[in-house]
């Protein structure tokens, strides 16, 4: 049963390692994959002394942990590399961190990617 499914056809693309990987640095990535598989967008980033450094953004193929997510939100408590995924075109354009183990009300840290 798949309810309220949001099709993902393209995602914001960014690669901090673009020169080594021989890719574009930034752009829009069309998401390809088997017709029976769902497509998602993702973002990975680091927090270096309070400064957000985006690692990668792009398409992320069929992952049940991304199903039914319209927003890209990381909830792991203090991960080394932050990761979030979502469904919907360009849904990784903005991403947030809500630490899940906080006792107090967590604050959102929305980030609008600005390539360096």
């Amino acid at each position: 049963a798949i309810l309220g499914r949001s099709e993902t056809q393209e995602c914001l693309f960014f690669n901090a390692n673009w020169e080594k990987d021989r890719t574009n640095q930034t752009g829009v990535e069309p998401c390809y994959g088997d017709k029976d598989k769902r497509r998602h967008c993702f973002a990975t980033w680091k927090n270096i002394s309070g400064s957000i450094e985006i690692v990668k953004q792009g398409c992320w193929l069929d992952d049940i942990n991304c199903y039914d997510r319209t927003d890209c939100v990381e909830k792991k408590d203090s991960p080394e590399v932050y990761f979030c995924c979502c469904e919907g075109n360009m849904c990784n354009e903005k991403f947030s961190y809500f630490p899940e183990m906080e006792v107090t009300q967590p604050t959102s840290n929305p980030v609008t990617p600005k390539p360096p």
């Epitope: 309220g4 029976d36 990975t44 992952d63 049940i64 942990n65 199903y67 039914d68 909830k75 995924c85």
Partner: antibody, heavy 119, light 107 residues
């Protein structure tokens, strides 16, 4: 610390029903897809069913489709498996497992609960 | 459904040995392959995901490689606590399927 605690297993006659529960703690349950995996005595692992973070998407192995129903109550941090029309071949230890974020893998498991289907 | 075939089904080794377990998928699964360790009476434990990424807290003597249809789990120097059964699992598409397991026993 992530903890998954299954309950509800036991002895049931063929054709009978059981409802398994999995109580989750130590993490934000509503942020993770969950699954049930079973292991027949002396055999390997078999994925049974999975459910997305909201419960809007559910998946089943062909061997249990139409007989088992997976569900979750995010307000109670609990995963369920309703098992109907049980057969002898459903006899197994049933594990509750969490889908890791960004891993596409079962990164945390419960200790399991034994379901025995026998007359 | 994607079939996962592990070999060998069992092996005997000594502490300090280098151990290699292989897993073959019936079709290409890219790098969507996970490895688990299970000890008798215990739940499985994730060792490696996405073919080669070590799960947090897993000793570096464990490593994974491969893509497409052929994958390998290597234990560089077998320790007493490594005697267990190891399973591969594809996460490319549902139904997610496991290999039959490889039991690593003491020689």
């Amino acid at each position: 610390e992530v903890q998954l605690l299954e309950s509800g297993g036991g002895l049931v006659q063929p054709g009978g029903s059981l409802r398994l529960s999995c109580a989750a703690s130590g993490f934000t349950f509503s942020n993770y897809a969950m699954a049930w995996v079973r292991q027949a005595p002396g055999k390997g692992l078999e994925w049974v069913s999975a459910i997305s973070v909201t419960g809007g998407s559910t998946y089943y192995a062909d061997s249990v489709k139409g007989r088992f129903t997976i569900s979750r109550d995010n307000s109670k941090n609990t995963l369920y498996l309703q098992m109907n029309s049980l057969r002898a071949e459903d006899t197994a230890v049933y594990y509750c497992a969490r889908h890791g974020s960004g891993t596409r893998a079962f990164d945390s498991w419960g200790q399991g609960t034994l379901v025995t289907v026998s007359s | 459904d994607i079939q996962m075939t592990q070999s060998p089904s069992s092996l005997s080794a000594s502490v300090g040995d280098r151990v290699t377990i292989t897993c073959r998928a019936s079709q290409s699964i890219s790098r969507h392959l996970n490895w688990y360790q299970q000890k008798p009476g215990k739940a499985p434990k994730l060792l490696i995901y996405e073919a080669s990424t070590l799960q947090t807290g897993v000793p570096s003597r464990f490593s994974g490689s491969g893509s497409g249809t052929d994958f390998t789990l290597t234990i560089s120097s077998l320790q007493p606590e490594d005697f267990a059964t190891y399973y591969c699992q594809q996460s490319y598409s549902t139904p997610w399927t496991f290999g039959g397991g490889t039991k690593v026993e003491i020689k």
